[in-house]
């Protein structure tokens, strides 16, 4: 099969303000093996907003059990959305390595919005 | 070589129920979600049903909800419908699609060749 | 759903644009993906030609293309061959529920 791809099936996301907005992943491939990551913003500045191997994220769960054998979809939710939160966000593959893993490839990206809470 | 071959389809009576049946090969049929596209003779493509690769969710679109049902059997690599209290309106060519991602019914990179199912009186 | 001409003609070597507009998510600012499909006689197995927008598998032949703006996605074929007489149907999905076609253009090589 080709090269894995990271595919984020949704261009753009609009969430109200206090729910959750769910961003979807999908890996074509269990290989390389290393780590996703879910940024927002690209380059330098990005802000990490998930690590599948450390960190503590209390926004933050996984769509799919993402210990499960053979997982290949990398959703996630963040909860309680705010303006603050607007932005696009990457779901990016990483390649195990030592003692760093190594950026493997990125998604699209997914822009999220956020509209007033309803009244 | 990306393979996917339907069988089951049929001639049946207003009411009836059929299973139609995908024999995958060529992939992993674990890492895509799969899906059912009919065609109704002189009209166009009508996605049916779609389940992931992932953790099996269902999707159907409104027309066939509460009576189609679909299921893989992913150490058979194969893809099943269940279609009962069929209509005459489900006559239609029943194709077996590979979709390109493992959740979500999104873009069908392979198709098999079609199974014929007739609702007829 | 999705909306395409129901027809459209080329020369021969000329280019042709087929475009397709709506889909899910315009309302509220979600927005997916389009993708194009060919099939060349009905009952025949559809083949993809684009998805993703503007991808098109290694097996399609360089003269279709796929573009997007908006809510609108076009498939250009350039240097169109007689054999790309056939129905083309556009597509698009949400990820929540599933996918829907356009009803298809028929394209006629002149």
């Known amino acids: 099969e080709d090269e894995l791809q990271v595919i984020q099936p949704e261009k753009s996301v609009s969430v109200a303000a206090g729910e959750s907005a769910t961003l979807r992943c999908a890996m074509t491939s269990l290989i390389p093996v290393g780590p996703i990551m879910w940024f927002r913003g690209a380059g330098a500045g990005r802000e990490l907003i998930y690590n599948q191997k450390e960190g503590h994220f209390p926004r933050v769960t996984t769509v799919s059990e993402l210990t499960k054998r053979n997982n290949l979809d990398f959703s996630i939710s963040i909860s309680n959305i705010t303006p603050a939160d607007a932005g696009t966000y990457y779901c990016v593959k990483f390649r195990k390595g030592s003692p760093d893993d190594v950026e493997f490839k990125s998604g699209a990206g997914t822009e999220l919005s956020v509209r007033a809470k309803p009244s | 070589d990306v393979q996917l071959v339907e069988s089951g389809g049929a001639v049946v009576r207003p009411g009836e129920s059929l299973r139609l049946s995908c024999k995958a090969s060529?992939?992993?049929?674990?890492?895509?979600?799969m899906s059912w596209v009919r065609q109704a003779p002189g009209e166009g493509l009508e996605w049916v049903s779609g389940?992931?690769?992932?953790?099996?969710?269902?999707y159907y679109a409104d027309s066939v909800k509460g009576r189609f049902t679909i299921s893989r059997d992913n150490s058979e690599s194969t893809l099943y419908l269940q279609m009962n209290s069929l209509r005459a309106e489900d006559t239609a060519v029943y194709y077996c699609?590979?979709?390109?991602?493992?959740?979500?019914?999104?873009?069908?990179?392979?198709w098999g060749l079609g199974t014929l199912v007739t609702v007829s009186s | 759903a999705l909306t395409q001409p129901a027809s459209v003609s080329a020369n021969l070597g000329g280019t042709v644009k087929i475009t397709c507009s709506g889909g899910?998510?315009?309302?509220?600012?979600?927005?997916?993906?389009y993708g194009w499909y060919q099939q060349k006689s009905p009952g025949s197995a559809p083949v993809i030609l684009i998805?993703?927008?503007?991808k098109r598998p290694s097996d399609i032949p360089s003269r279709f293309s796929g573009s997007t703006s908006g809510s609108t996605t076009t498939l250009t074929i350039t240097g169109v061959q007689a054999e790309d007489e056939a129905v083309y149907f556009c597509?698009?999905?949400?990820?929540?529920?599933?996918?829907?076609f356009g009803a298809g253009t028929t394209l006629t090589v002149l």
């Open positions: 597509g698009t999905y949400d990820t929540s529920s599933g996918a829907i």
């Open positions: 060529g992939f992993t049929f674990t890492n895509f979600a």
């Open positions: 899910y998510g315009s309302d509220d600012g979600s927005s997916s993906y």
């Open positions: 389940i992931s690769g992932s953790d099996d969710t269902t």
């Open positions: 699609v590979k979709d390109s991602t493992v959740s979500w019914n999104t873009f069908f990179d392979y």
């Open positions: 998805y993703w927008d503007d």
